[in-house]
Interface confidence: low
């Protein structure tokens, strides 16, 4: 981006996406959190939000900071899911 990436601004804005996603996931019973088809619309909305917020502050998306934030959200909601039950891609360094 011409004006450069405002990483601080992005880290301030991304939690808004996380909160909106958490609010939506509150409608999904916890035992369904490993079934992506139950909340795919919410998840797509979340990823679109992170992309938009990154772009607003002049950052490319995806980027390491945004992916780190998304990984944190994955941990919060999907840490108990086996790989074959939820198909969400974490950054390569998250094994």
């Amino acid at each position: 981006r011409a004006g450069g990436c405002n990483e601080t601004g992005m880290l301030e804005r991304l939690p808004l996406c996380g909160k909106a996603f958490a609010d939506m996931m509150g409608k999904v019973d916890v035992w369904k959190w490993c079934n992506l088809s139950e909340f795919i619309v919410y998840y797509e909305s979340f990823t679109n939000c992170t992309e938009m917020e990154a772009n607003v502050v002049g950052c490319y998306w995806p980027n390491p900071l945004a992916q780190g934030f998304i990984t944190g959200i994955h941990r919060q909601f999907f840490s108990n899911c086996t790989v074959d039950r939820v198909h969400l891609e974490d950054p390569p360094d998250e094994v």
Epitope: A22, D23, M24, M25, G26, K27, D29, V30, W31, E38
Partner: antibody, heavy 115, light 111 residues
Framework: QEQLEESEGGLFKPTDTLTLTCTVS????????LTWVRQAPGNGLEWIGA???????YYASWAKSRSTITRNTNENTVTLKMTSLTAADTATYFC?????????WGPGTLVTVSS | DGVMTQTPSSVSAAVGGTVTISCQSS????????LSWFQQKPGQPPKLLIY???KLESGVPDRFSGSGSGTQFTLTISGVQCDDAATYYC???????????FGGGTEVVVK
């Protein structure tokens, strides 16, 4: 061990406001929904409302206008506040973990509304 | 409004027999599977038996089973035991959360 316990009920007068607190242990309110259910003496179960893991609240249509469910995730408590009590609100009130898969219940507390 | 009509209100069964309890919903439950079954004994809180129409809750004997779809649901107790004497309730959740409701209950008497 996952447990819930409702605060003590007791005797209330018509028009009073009921405040019940559910204290949970062994699980996080940030992960699980918490539901309130009541049961009038000799009657069936009645869904009052719930608070989702996100903090969103949901109420039965009959309870919406006079019920408020709040939570304190730091203290692991959920509070049900019900205004304008009448004799019809006499019941055992239960808090329970979950929304439809409600699989951990408190023992219940008896609330009596009488003049 | 979401109304769960549960039948029968009372049923008697012999030990080893089969009991079938029905719940008819006035509208489709949320995601077509937000339907649970509970057992309650006097002086105790309810106990979850079945969730998502047919999934057996952990620790519940497999003589309990749930079935159904759309607006019609059934709880079956096969090989009834004395310990199964209780009142059973269905619970349906809907798109509009304010419609979430229990059925009226079915008392099961074991002879």
């Amino acid at each position: 061990q996952e447990q819930l316990e409702e605060s003590e009920g007791g005797l209330f007068k018509p028009t009073d406001t009921l405040t019940l607190t559910c204290t949970v242990s062994g699980f996080s309110l940030s992960v699980y929904a918490l539901t309130w259910v009541r049961q009038a003496p000799g009657n069936g179960l009645e869904w009052i409302g719930a608070i989702g893991n996100s903090g969103n609240t949901y109420y039965a249509s009959w309870a919406k206008s006079r019920s408020t469910i709040t939570r304190n995730t730091n203290e692991n408590t959920v509070t049900l506040k019900m205004t304008s009590l009448t004799a019809a609100d006499t019941a055992t009130y239960f808090c329970a973990r979950g929304y439809v898969r409600i699989n951990v219940w408190g023992p219940g507390t008896l609330v009596t509304v009488s003049s | 409004d979401g109304v769960m009509t549960q039948t029968p209100s009372s049923v008697s069964a012999a030990v080893g027999g089969t009991v079938t309890i029905s719940c008819q919903s006035s509208q489709s439950v949320y995601k077509n599977n937000y339907l649970s079954w509970f057992q309650q004994k006097p002086g105790q809180p309810p106990k979850l038996l079945i969730y998502e129409i047919s999934k057996l809750e952990s620790g519940v004997p497999d003589r309990f089973s749930g079935s159904g779809s759309g607006t019609q649901f059934t709880l079956t107790i096969s090989g009834v035991q004395c310990d199964d004497a209780a009142t059973y309730y269905c619970l349906g959740g809907y798109d509009d959360d304010s419609d979430t409701s229990f059925g009226g209950g079915t008392e099961v008497v074991v002879k």
